[in-house]
């Protein structure tokens, strides 16, 4: 667990959110890609 000094602006410093979702195919697209292949 995180002690208080690990929090800044209310979020755990070490916890990383997922990448922003990608909506690649124009106005009609409802699919999202968040995790591209690693190279």
């Amino acid at each position: 667990s995180y002690s208080m000094e690990h929090f800044r602006w209310g979020k755990p410093v070490g916890k990383k959110r997922r990448p922003v979702k990608v909506y690649p195919n124009g106005a009609e697209d409802e699919s999202a890609e968040a995790f591209p292949l690693e190279f």
Partner: antibody, heavy 110, light 112 residues
């Protein structure tokens, strides 16, 4: 699906201003949204974002200067205490995509 | 925060030529890198995401490469319509101390 910003106007320094991004054709409960700005003749600058679940993150320079919140169809960007350096066109963007609004111009001047 | 450094600031090439734009991230962003094209008075247009995947309707003359911290955008067979400013964008996840969404400073492409 469309995205449109509104609320941009001429304000004096220190006067809070809230910009609204209104979306149609999709629900914000399923999409990540980013606020980006562009000063006249300058490059793109990411201010902050709100994830589909409502979690918000801000660029370091933007913390304490902006707040982002949302409903099911709108995303608000509040400029807490505008300075002349906040003069820019503000864009709302659906994640990484071609869903950018046309932008709304904020001018901060005394 | 992730800082994106883009070079050059401006580049000029002839119709039919090739230009390469470089983008460097201050920390590894895996392949969470997009490229946008912006023309005056318009919002940016998505060209490439996941570092190398072309967005819908983008011609294959645009090629993105790279991963980690080093990325490039190459535009071949330049057309007059390619004259624009190009931006790289990281979209890695954020944490409480590091914001993962950042743009490069932009590269103006001038087509002669």
């Amino acid at each position: 699906q469309s995205v449109k910003e509104s609320g941009g106007r001429l304000v004096t320094p220190g006067t809070p201003l809230t910009l609204t991004c209104t979306v149609s054709g999709f629900s914000l409960s399923n999409y990540d949204m980013i606020w980006v700005r562009q000063a006249p003749g300058k490059g793109l600058e990411s201010i902050g974002m709100i994830y589909d679940d409502g979690d918000t993150y801000y660029a370091s320079w933007a913390k304490g200067r902006f707040t982002i919140s949302k409903t099911s169809t709108t995303v608000d960007l509040k400029i807490i205490s505008p300075t002349t350096e906040d003069t820019a066109t503000y864009f709302c963007v659906k994640g990484v995509s071609n869903h950018w609004g046309p932008g709304t111009l904020v001018t901060v001047s005394s | 925060d992730v800082v994106m450094t883009q070079t050059p600031a401006s580049v000029e090439a002839a119709v039919g030529g090739t230009v390469t734009i470089k983008c460097q991230a201050s920390q590894s962003i895996s392949s969470y890198l997009a490229w946008y094209q912006q023309k005056p008075g318009q919002p940016p247009k998505l060209l490439i995401y996941s570092a190398s995947t072309l967005a819908s309707g983008v011609p294959s003359r645009f090629k993105g490469r790279g991963s980690g911290t080093e990325f490039t955008l190459t535009i071949s067979d330049l057309e007059c319509a390619d004259a624009a400013t190009y931006y790289c964008q990281s979209y890695d996840g954020s944490s409480g101390s590091s914001y993962g969404v950042g743009f490069g400073g932009g590269t103006e492409v001038v087509v002669k």
